[in-house]
């Protein structure tokens, strides 16, 4: 008996009613007395609704299901699910038995739109260019988890210092809070876009900040605009320079390097001499170049924890300051590939391929491909765990049904270094064992 259901998931908004379509072709002379129709949850086999012995046996699923009884005789075995909840998401099997039987599963994908984001700013008073502010974008009661994007007033992405958290409430709906830490320019618009990936629905919020002009010091301090990228364990130079006037002497100079956010002292030169490192004894100035206006800082044996913004503050008679960002990076190791199960494999078997790459920073992007270059985006789970040094080990798991043979490749990218590490596994023949026996 051929039972037909939609191939694509049925998308239903929380609180609305959903129809899980299912149909069969009744033969001539078919009567409902011959019909056994059972709807059940595919995974747990929990009964949802049934029609047997010529009558509707009713809902076994929170009294929220109904059949289209007037259409059953024409072969319409669809199920109406009322007041959809997040917990309803999953696969439902429609089982039809007359003389023969047949069954098919239909997926229910639950969705809820996110609210228009509310934007908050901290601090929100006496703001000056160069201040670091925290902008929070909050959007509520959506499902499934949102994708959050930040943009500046020109539409350019703000991917810098963003932390996004999503918490499910008791109904399973998510509240999303995304926090952007940013150094203010002269003025700027900061936009947050909360996307529901199932509904492809976007909710926008934005905030425009016009800080007061700060009293400009007469000393112009110059630092690189782009972040300084340093590999873990190497030394980094945070460049900073000023233009000394004629007759300038180091006795007039106050130079302070500090962490931009916490104002923690890193290194200083005052009263004509190097006051040394206040930062784990890993910093040094270029003392022989100071008189020419080179106030750069050398940071030795860079660690992940060093990542962030450093402010170079120069005072002679007047003062000036500028912040330079340090971006820490570490390359990922060549991925190791494991296969489970790894013996007696046959086409049609479901296997788990794990791709593991170690001690990289920042978090990796992972991509899977088949042997023809097509993306494998299906059943992929990627987890990244930081060790005590803050370096990430990445494990990406692909669940796939084997064909007659195939190559499965994993690419681990370090987004800062634009460095790629590749691993691949080729599964051939049938039956087979992995790794192939000698």
């Amino acid at each position: 008996l051929e039972v037909q259901v939609p191939e694509d998931p049925v998308v239903a908004l929380v609180g609305t009613d959903a129809t899980l379509r299912c149909s069969f072709s009744p033969e001539p002379g078919f009567s409902l007395a011959q019909l056994n129709l059972i709807w059940q949850l595919t995974d747990t086999k929990q009964l949802v609704h049934s029609f047997t012995e010529g009558r509707d046996q009713g809902s076994a699923y929170a009294n929220r299901t109904a059949l289209f009884l007037d259409l059953l005789a024409q072969g319409n075995a669809s199920l109406r699910l009322q007041r959809v909840r997040v917990a309803d998401e999953g696969s439902f099997t429609c089982f039809v038995s007359i003389r023969d039987f047949g069954s098919a599963a239909v997926s229910l994908q639950v969705a809820a739109p996110y609210s228009k984001p509310s934007m908050t700013l901290e601090p929100n008073k006496d703001l000056r260019p160069g201040d670091t502010v925290t902008i929070t974008c909050s959007s509520y009661r959506g499902y499934p988890e949102a994708e959050v994007f930040w943009q500046d007033g020109q539409g350019a992405p703000l991917t810098g210092n963003v932390t996004t958290s999503q918490m499910a409430n008791e109904q399973g709906l998510f509240d999303v809070h995304s926090v952007l830490r940013v150094v203010l320019g002269a003025n700027g618009t900061y936009s947050c876009l909360v996307r529901n990936p199932v509904l492809q629905q976007d909710a926008h919020g934005s905030i425009t900040i016009t800080p007061q002009r700060s009293p400009t010091g007469a000393v112009e301090v110059q630092v690189p605009e782009d972040p300084v990228v340093a590999l873990v364990g190497t030394d980094a130079t945070l460049r900073c320079s000023f233009s000394p006037e004629p007759g300038f002497s180091l006795a007039q100079l106050n130079l302070i390097w500090q962490l931009t956010d916490t104002k923690q002292l890193v290194h200083s030169f005052t009263e004509g001499r190097d006051q040394g490192s206040a930062y784990a004894n890993r910093t040094a100035l270029f003392l022989d170049l100071l008189a020419q206006g080179n106030a750069s800082l050398r940071l030795q044996r860079v660690r992940v924890a060093d990542e962030g913004s450093f402010t170079c503050f120069v005072s002679i008679r007047d003062f000036g300051s500028a912040a330079v960002s340090l971006q820490v990076a570490a390359p990922y190791s060549k991925p190791s590939m494991t296969l489970e199960p790894n013996k007696d494999l046959r086409p049609g078997d479901t296997v788990t391929i794990t791709c593991s790459s170690y001690r990289g920073y920042p978090e990796a992007e992972v991509f899977w491909q088949d042997g023809q270059g097509a993306p494998l985006t299906g059943n992929v789970t990627t987890s990244q765990m930081a060790n005590e040094q803050g370096l990430f080990d990445v494990h990406s798991v692909l669940r796939v049904v084997l064909g007659a043979n195939g190559t499965y490749s994993c690419l681990v990218r370090n987004p800062v270094l634009q460095q790629d590490a590749h691993g691949s596994v080729t599964i051939t023949g049938q039956p087979m064992t992995f790794p192939p026996e000698a």
Partner: antibody
Framework: EVQLVQSGAEVKKPGSSVKVSCKAS????????IHWVRQAPGQGLEWMGY????????DYAQKFQGRVTLTADKSTSTAYMELSSLRSEDTAVYYC??????????????WGQGTTVTVSS | EIVLTQSPDFQSVTPKEKVTITCRAS?????MNWYQQKPDQSPKPWIY???NLASGVPSRFSVSVSGTDHTLTINSLEAEDAATYYC?????????FGQGTKLEIK
């Protein structure tokens, strides 16, 4: 020499179907996927879908789902693209292309010469 | 779907000028490919796997990447470079192309 040679230009009426062929030579036909890309007059490139001639697996861009059928005949090393329910907006040059390379460096390395399909009443 | 947005759509440049074309991906991609197409011709592979020049492509062409921005640079434009350039990804379905950037010689 690796080549993809396509069938000639077609003029079709709205509502009808067209079937374009793409004959491969100079390489193992079953080793690479064949993709179909179209280009409307004065417009950019638009991916329609692909077929793996070995497994006959196909994948279509959502826009063409239900209207396009990709097939492959291993015995003649020929791929086919059939587009049904034609409308005037389907007037375009249709290209077949081989997606080639080695993991993970894949790209369209060989293109057919293109087949012009004109839909007009 | 990953949307690829090229800028500019059109550029008129003089020979020997340095030219840049940017392809911005709506989310990160494993690799980007680039194709060159001249009027009444099929596209030709130009740059594959982000930064590798296809066979016969002159070394004045290069690609740099910053985040999701892929920038194709022609160091010193020559008359033969007049064409439309397309970027393409297949890191996730569906495969997508940029809308194209047409380079014209002044």
């Amino acid at each position: 020499e690796v080549q993809l040679v396509q069938s000639g230009a077609e003029v079709k009426k709205p509502g009808s179907s067209v079937k374009v062929s793409c004959k491969a030579s100079g390489y193992s036909f079953t080793s690479y996927t064949i993709h179909w890309v179209r280009q409307a007059p004065g417009q950019g490139l638009e991916w329609m879908g692909y077929i793996n001639p070995n497994s006959r697996n196909t994948d279509y861009a959502q826009k063409f789902q239900g209207r396009v059928t990709l097939t492959a005949d291993k015995s003649t090393s020929t791929a086919y693209m059939e587009l049904s329910s034609l409308r005037s907006e389907d007037t375009a040059v249709y290209y077949c292309a081989r997606y080639s390379g080695s993991t993970p460096y894949w790209y369209f390395d060989v293109w057919g010469q293109g087949t012009t399909v004109t839909v007009s009443s | 779907e990953i949307v690829l947005t090229q800028s500019p759509d059109f550029q008129s440049v003089t020979p020997k000028e340095k030219v840049t074309i940017t392809c911005r991906a709506s989310s990160s991609v494993s690799y980007m490919n680039w194709y060159q197409q001249k009027p009444d011709q099929s596209p030709k592979p130009w740059i594959y796997a982000t930064s590798n020049l296809a066979s016969g492509v002159p070394s004045r062409f290069s690609v740099s990447v910053s985040g999701t921005d892929h920038t194709l640079t022609i160091n010193s434009l020559e008359a033969e470079d007049a064409a439309t350039y397309y970027c393409q990804q297949w890191s996730s379905n569906p495969l997508t192309f940029g809308q194209g950037t047409k380079l014209e010689i002044k």
